[in-house]
Interface confidence: medium
């Protein structure tokens, strides 16, 4: 029988009555244009909903918007449009919500053409009250909060001015003109690129990268001939034009741009691109596009300095700059990433790594699934996951893969089972061990979300017809119950739950459509009465992550350590609760050569775990070098993989070589790093 119909699945008793008492409908009695929803703060229950519609007139488009506020996780909403003087809010800027629990909100208003500047509405009390502020400029981007101080705001103007506010948008100061891109760094530092002559587009590759650490009082030029820049983890990256031709190279800094190193990565031409796929304080996943319109490139993983890169995955699917890739960080288990490759026959296949890009492999075929028509051998095939690339291709995939750090090991994704991704209607699959094994969870495409740190999974069928049924599981997707949340079906547009997967409330958004009426409606369901009791010690079981061979002493060792987690038993129907903290017990592993990558000037011959010196650094290899305050580079040929915590065991000792003669970089000479004051 189908999942959810077994006798043993009837564990949740009287759930219809329990859920009916906790289902709250809200009809937004005025519209059906577009709707955007933002959570304000963490565990506050405050949601802001901005509804917008445009009335097309002959000469112009007249817009109208309404603002609603809930403080009970969406069960009830109050129209607070009057707090923003019934002003039309620009949806392209969205609602700028302050970091952490600052309670700050900035809404950017639409103003008439002749006005001197834009207008914002600011709240510091979780949208209970708003202050109107007229700006001395027209904003081009949403207001950007400093991650360290939510009173500090940054914005670019339509005239490419860089504006800063130190008092949460009350007063603004233009600190620089001719700015293309600006970003907050750490410690309230601002990085930005600026053009000297024409415009951002015309000067691409000739931009300067500047830094201010005092909100615009003084500046330092930290890069020239810049194409673009990015921040990832503790790394600052700059894509820099080469002297002689139109190629560009990645340079890396770990000291906010004071010193730079040239990354040991291939240079790219005009039509190619670099992309930071993922970055943390330890390392970076970098995609380097192949020459030509191939739609793929190579993934490289960095060392702890962001300088030395190991080739991680060939033929990585990534269509164009700013295009789509399937690269997914599985946040529910350390070291796990999923992505897609474009094989020689142009089919797309999914690959997974469990060790932060060290090795990639196909996903194991789910036990309860057959190989589809793409499989040559009906007994041997793999699971292939649909991610944002599939969504961009308009396949019937309503959601990207889902994982949450506090729902340990759980990964939910649409996929197909065969030799490659299929364009047929996908099913939904779940892994409870971070991607090692998979099970078909739901037939056909669905929207899904995780509640109560994995204690409940909720799903809604993706259908063009109106729906009125929600499915939920209390055992990590093995068994499903269905609940009819409304008598009158709605056209479903989205599921909303508080970010962080700790909530037990889910909001179902959609619209009703009848001959006379088309309006937004939300149903918020609180599952608190389904999980009646708090989980106790007996409800949890010990689970060793990354375990593939229990007989092996090193079983579960990934990046030099193994972790045991306390995980909720599938049979336990109880609340993890909002304050649930993942309990894990790490233990250090012995080092092997697998825990090291080859340093600059060294490589691993195929099928060998030893690093050997490159015979000679010649030609363009000479540019792969370290430039900084130090005059020389020393190495023993091995470098510990970033984040690897192994101890003892293999300790590769090498004669230290001085490579300074082999290495030059001309990115920035210290004399160019002049300081400027306002």
């Amino acid at each position: 029988s189908a999942p959810g119909e077994d006798e043993e699945c009837g564990r949740v008793r009287d759930f219809v009555a329990k859920l009916a008492n906790n289902t709250h409908q809200h009809v937004f009695d005025d519209l059906r244009g577009s709707v955007s929803l933002s959570w304000v703060g963490d565990s506050t229950g405050v949601i802001l909903v901005l509804t917008t519609f445009h009335v097309p007139l002959v000469i112009m488009t007249f817009g109208q918007s309404k603002l609603y506020r809930s403080e009970d996780y969406g069960k009830n909403f109050k129209d607070i449009t009057d707090l923003i003087n019934n002003t039309f809010i620009r949806t392209e800027f969205g609602m700028a919500i302050g970091p952490e629990n600052s309670g700050k909100v900035v809404l950017t208003a639409e103003v008439s053409g002749g006005s001197r500047g834009g207008r914002i509405f600011r709240s510091s009390d979780f949208a209970k009250n708003f202050v109107q502020t007229d700006l001395p400029f027209h904003p081009l981007t949403q207001m950007m909060y400093s991650p360290q101080n939510s009173d500090y705001l940054l914005a670019l103007s339509t005239e490419n001015g860089l504006w800063v506010s130190k008092n949460f948008g009350g007063k603004w100061e233009e600190i620089h003109k001719a700015v293309c891109l600006a970003k907050w760094g750490s410690d309230n530092t601002i990085f930005f690129t600026t053009y000297a002559n024409g415009s951002c587009k015309a000067d691409l590759g000739a931009l300067e990268l500047w830094r201010t650490s005092d909100l615009g009082k003084s500046f330092k030029t930290i890069g020239v001939k810049i194409y673009s820049f990015g921040l990832g983890g503790r790394f600052l990256f700059a894509s820099v034009m080469a002297d002689k031709d139109t190629t560009r190279r990645i340079h890396v800094s770990t000291d906010q741009g004071d010193t730079w190193s040239m990354a040991q990565l291939p240079s790219v031409g005009q039509e190619q691109f670099y992309s930071i796929l993922a970055a943390n304080d330890d390392m970076v996943f970098m995609h380097v596009d192949e020459p030509g319109d191939t739609g793929f490139g190579t993934i490289f993983t960095s060392d702890d300095r962001g300088i030395v890169y190991s080739k991680s995955l060939d033929r990585h699917l990534y269509t164009t700059t700013g295009g789509e890739t399937a690269f997914t960080n599985v946040t529910s288990l350390r070291g796990v990433y999923i992505t897609s490759v474009l094989s020689e026959d142009n089919s797309i296949q999914t690959m997974i790594t469990f060790d932060q890009g060290g090795r990639w492999t196909h996903l194991r075929k789910p036990e309860n699934s057959e190989c589809d028509a793409t499989a040559k051998n009906k007994n041997e095939c793999s699971l292939h996951i649909h991610a944002s690339y599939s969504i961009s291709q308009k396949l019937n995939v309503p959601m990207a893969p889902l994982s949450e750090p506090n729902a340990v090991g759980i990964v939910i994704a649409h996929g197909s089972v065969g030799d490659a991704i299929s364009v047929m209607v996908p099913d939904v699959y779940i892994s409870d061990d971070g991607g090692y094994s998979w099970t078909k969870m739901l037939e056909g495409p669905h929207y899904y979300t995780i509640l109560d740190s994995g204690g409940i999974i909720v799903a809604i069928e993706h259908s063009s017809r109106p729906i009125n049924v929600i499915k939920f599981s209390t055992d990590e997707g093995q068994c499903w119950q269905t609940y009819t949340f409304t008598r009158d079906p709605i056209y479903f547009t989205g599921l909303a739950s508080e970010p962080g997967a700790r909530s037990m409330n889910i909001s179902i958004w959609g619209f009703t459509e009848s001959f006379l009426t088309s309006q937004w409606v939300s149903y918020t369901i609180d599952f608190k009465d389904i999980l009646e009791r708090n989980c106790e010690e007996k409800d949890y079981t010990i689970w060793l992550a990354h375990s593939t061979d229990p007989e092996d002493y090193e079983d579960g060792c990934i990046l030099g350590y193994k972790e045991q987690f306390l995980r909720l038993r599938k049979s336990s129907v109880c609340q993890n609760g909002r304050d649930y903290v993942v309990t894990k017990q790490p233990s250090i592993c012995l080092c092997s050569l697998e825990d090291f990558l080859c340093d600059f000037g060294y490589y691993r011959p195929e099928n060998d775990s030893k690093c050997v010196e490159q015979p000679e650094l010649k030609g363009h290899d000479l540019e792969f070098c370290l430039y900084g305050r130090e005059e020389h580079l020393t190495t023993n040929g091995y470098r510990k993989i970033p984040g690897d915590k192994c101890q003892g065991g293999v300790n590769p000792v090498r004669e230290v070589k001085d490579l300074k003669k082999k290495c030059t970089s001309n990115f920035l000479s210290p004399e160019k790093q002049n300081s400027k004051s306002n």
């Epitope: 059906r32 244009g33 109208q64 459509e513 001959f515 006379l516 009426t517 088309s518």
Partner: antibody, heavy 124, light 106 residues
Framework: QVQLVQSGAEVKKPGSSVKVSCKAS????????ISWVRQAPGQGLEWMGG????????NYAQKFQGRVTITADESTSTAYMELSSLRSEDTAVYYC?????????????????WGQGTTVTVSS | DIQMTQSPSTLSASVGDRVTITCRAS??????LAWYQQKPGKAPKLLIY???SLESGVPSRFSGSGSGTEFTLTISSLQPDDFATYYC????????FGGGTKVEIK
Amino acid sequence: QVQLVQSGAEVKKPGSSVKVSCKASGGTFRNYAISWVRQAPGQGLEWMGGIIPIGGWANYAQKFQGRVTITADESTSTAYMELSSLRSEDTAVYYCARQGRKTGYYYYYGMDVWGQGTTVTVSS
Amino acid sequence: DIQMTQSPSTLSASVGDRVTITCRASQSISSWLAWYQQKPGKAPKLLIYKASSLESGVPSRFSGSGSGTEFTLTISSLQPDDFATYYCQQADGHITFGGGTKVEIK
């Protein structure tokens, strides 16, 4: 300015069907609804049903359920009303009207543009 | 279906008079009510929508009020062009019209 132009007068035998067309010109067709209203000689207005062209969503008054079919062709901006099993009491002037809907775009219920009317006579 | 009852069915008045027509719904229809004017041999013309909003191009002597179940159309100063039949129409569920009020010359 939006105009609704209806097809010409019809004389029908009892038991037969009539199909009246209503073509919109000069404005948006799809976001509104088209209502059909009839008026028997010397009587008041009677709503028969309507359609939302954008989704082909038809809606009928209880009295006419099963006897009336309302359709729309977005490509030609034309709505149609077909009434079957005609009887003498169906003799009336049939109007189409543009019906505002309670949506983000047209925020009222009111028939703001009307066709000129089509006289249908049912007689043996 | 919601029933709409209009009163009076006939009303005799003179030019310059203030005229009031009432429409009662069998259940609450919020503000989803429209008023129309119809002259013999012509299609109806929308005067008021959403109970009190004046359709563009309609003279300001026409006004609508009410919500829930009781609604009123008022002509503040009757003009020669205003002698016609007036209909109310609800649009809360299926559409229904009132029976009409004929305004004739006294």
